[in-house]
């Protein structure tokens, strides 16, 4: 057994439409068939769960219908997209990976991706 390492980018800038994407990669110590990925947001020492999805290796990960996250998986890599972000959502987004099955269970936690969100300036009225 060895500890599971999770890697994610340090910084991501959300698009003007409030969409941020980043890759969460984990070094799997075992042959997991069921994986759970959770995105946590840490801001001012408060932690909240943004979204979570469990998937079978080889299959797509599916978030709940009302989730602000979407994602795709490829091997030990998960491509995560968070939508609907506003400036107030700026914070550290941490990728948590759990190898649920078969035993043993493994937990890996990334160092977090600082997502910066800048609300677009409203378009000024134009005089012609």
């Amino acid at each position: 057994c060895k500890a599971m390492h999770v890697a994610q980018p340090a910084v991501v800038l959300a698009s003007s439409r409030g969409i941020a994407s980043f890759v969460c990669e984990y070094a799997s110590p075992g042959k997991a068939t069921e994986v759970r990925v959770t995105v946590l947001r840490q801001a001012d020492s408060q932690v909240t769960e943004v979204c979570a999805a469990t998937y079978m290796m080889g299959n797509e990960l599916t978030f709940l219908d009302d989730s602000i996250c979407t994602g795709t998986s490829s091997g030990n890599q998960v491509n995560l997209t968070i939508q609907g972000l506003r400036a107030m959502d700026t914070g550290l987004y941490i990728c948590k990976v759990e190898l649920m099955y078969p035993p043993p269970y493994y937990l890996g936690i990334g160092n977090g991706t600082q997502i910066y969100v800048i609300d677009p300036e409203p378009c000024p009225d134009s005089d012609f």
């Epitope: 060895k2 500890a3 599971m4 946590l40 769960e49 979570a52 649920m100 937990l107 890996g108 936690i109």
Partner: antibody
Amino acid sequence: QVQLVESGGGVVQPGSSLRLSCAASGFTFSSHGMHWVRQAPGKGLEWVAVIWYDGSNKHYADSVKGRFTTSRDNSKNTLHLQMNSLRAEDTAVYFCARGGYFGCFDYWGQGTLVTVSS
Amino acid sequence: EIVLTQSPGTLSLSPGERATLSCRASQSVSSSCLAWYQQKPGQAPRLLIYGASSRATGIPDRFSGSGSGTDFTLTISRLEPEDFAVYYCQQYGISPFTFGPGTKVDIK
């Protein structure tokens, strides 16, 4: 605020069964793994079992595998530990604990005492 | 399974003194998955430190954690009367999750 309250402990004979419960409140129960940890009189902490999120995955300590079963009812915010074929060495205070977002056991119940004696 | 060893078994100190508790793992543990708990007689354990060095909510800053790999340390900078208790380290990165045997900090 987060609260965990265990119940169901008592004195039983070797070979018998007992069912412990843990009532949870103050948080989104289904978003957390839930653990059972025990402590024999005057001894240290021993992890017993965990049940994850929707209840489909469970893991057990070797010392209780095949004898203990944990379950959860997310609609009632309740956790259970069914203990069968009890032995004298199962005598302990049993705690339920919440698996925090980062995996550590961030909240604990007050514990319930199980005594297995003839 | 990962075996955790704590030392010393008992630490006898006076209030105001510094306490240094050690936890050693039989194999490498992710620093994200190492916690310290405090337990007083007749009470449930209380989370102090998670992720090797992050203080849990409401824990005073005299408690600090450090370390990586197989060696971890809990430091109490100045012991207060309420700090005399048993301290356990725990790894929660791989099942079965394991606790150390504990270090008792008592009054000299």
